[in-house]
Amino acid sequence: NFMYSKTVKRLSKLQEYQQYYPSLTCVMEGKDMEDWSCCPTPWTSFQSSCYFISTVMQSWTKSQNNCSVMGADLVVINTKEEQDFITQNLKINSAYFLGLSDPKGWRHWQWVDQTPYNKNVTFWHSGEPNSPDERCAIINFRSEEWGWNDVHCHVPQKSICKMKKIYI
């Protein structure tokens, strides 16, 4: 009876999410393997988040709007482990917008989800950021490593979206 009601609840939750995401990929987790954590297909998952790499070349503002329509934001990178996971799926000859910008050009960087910008947990390439006119951040491969660079926001780039996992 308990299992039946839990299944019914799950199905109704799945139906609710289906209007936003036609397909979800779920895995069982939790100490009793009773919880399901899901990401939209074909997003990838890491820890408590889902990630989507958009190969559409768009400005930073349009990229953020595009993520927003999918219930996500441009990616906020909190740890080196998270960055290492993300970069496994990136092409080394491409650049991807992050959810990091400096709209006034005062070198006051801010994350799209209002996560405080912590200078100690940043992965700028050497010598970056280097221009007050370059007010948006990308991640790209340079000098044998992945790192961040400030670029013009209006220049179209690929992008990475991030959202919280869906728990059902």
Partner: antibody, heavy 121, light 111 residues
Amino acid sequence: EVQLVESGGGLVKPGGSLRLSCAASGFTFSSYGMSWVRQAPGKGLEWVSTISSGDSYTYYPDSVKGRFTISRDNAKNSLYLQMNSLRAEDTAVYYCARQLYYSYGYYFDYWGQGTTVTVSS
Amino acid sequence: DIVLTQSPASLAVSPGQRATITCRASESVSFHGTHLMHWYQQKPGQPPKLLIYAASNLESGVPARFSGSGSETDFTLTINPVEANDAANYYCQQSIEDPPTFGGGTKVEIK
């Protein structure tokens, strides 16, 4: 006082080349992105190319890509536009313009007087 | 590319009256309260001159008779009251994404 002075325009045959120059003064040239914008006779404004302050970024519309090259010499406070394989439709007044960044975009806050390019046989 | 459509193509206004020019973008040029639409005035034989930046900010030295408003896709330049030396072509321009694009222009004539 900010000044932008274009030169190098003239009459050229189709398929020919021209190099336009823009001499900048009255501001720290190396700190600003610059653009070329053109205006065909009796027509509206058309952006032609952009170069970032540090020379790291150049951008062109499809109509001139592969034929025009924008460059700058910050030591000489000068902006250039090398125009090759010129066509009749490139006939226009060419303006150099300074870009001023605002939030996620920019606008053109100062313009030169323009130099006229005529492509005709 | 973002297409900017200006209307009307031309208008004739008497001195002291109000002139209103609209610019419609094919997609939004706004982001979180910032509107990346700008307006220029061009008199015959002269280069364009910046009037308004970011939809509503008056460029230094431009008379307060000029004002701008709008958001997302619809923007307006208003001249009130119009003076004789306002006869010119007026252009809108967006910069939210490359390539930067201009409207086709509006010719303002003084009756």
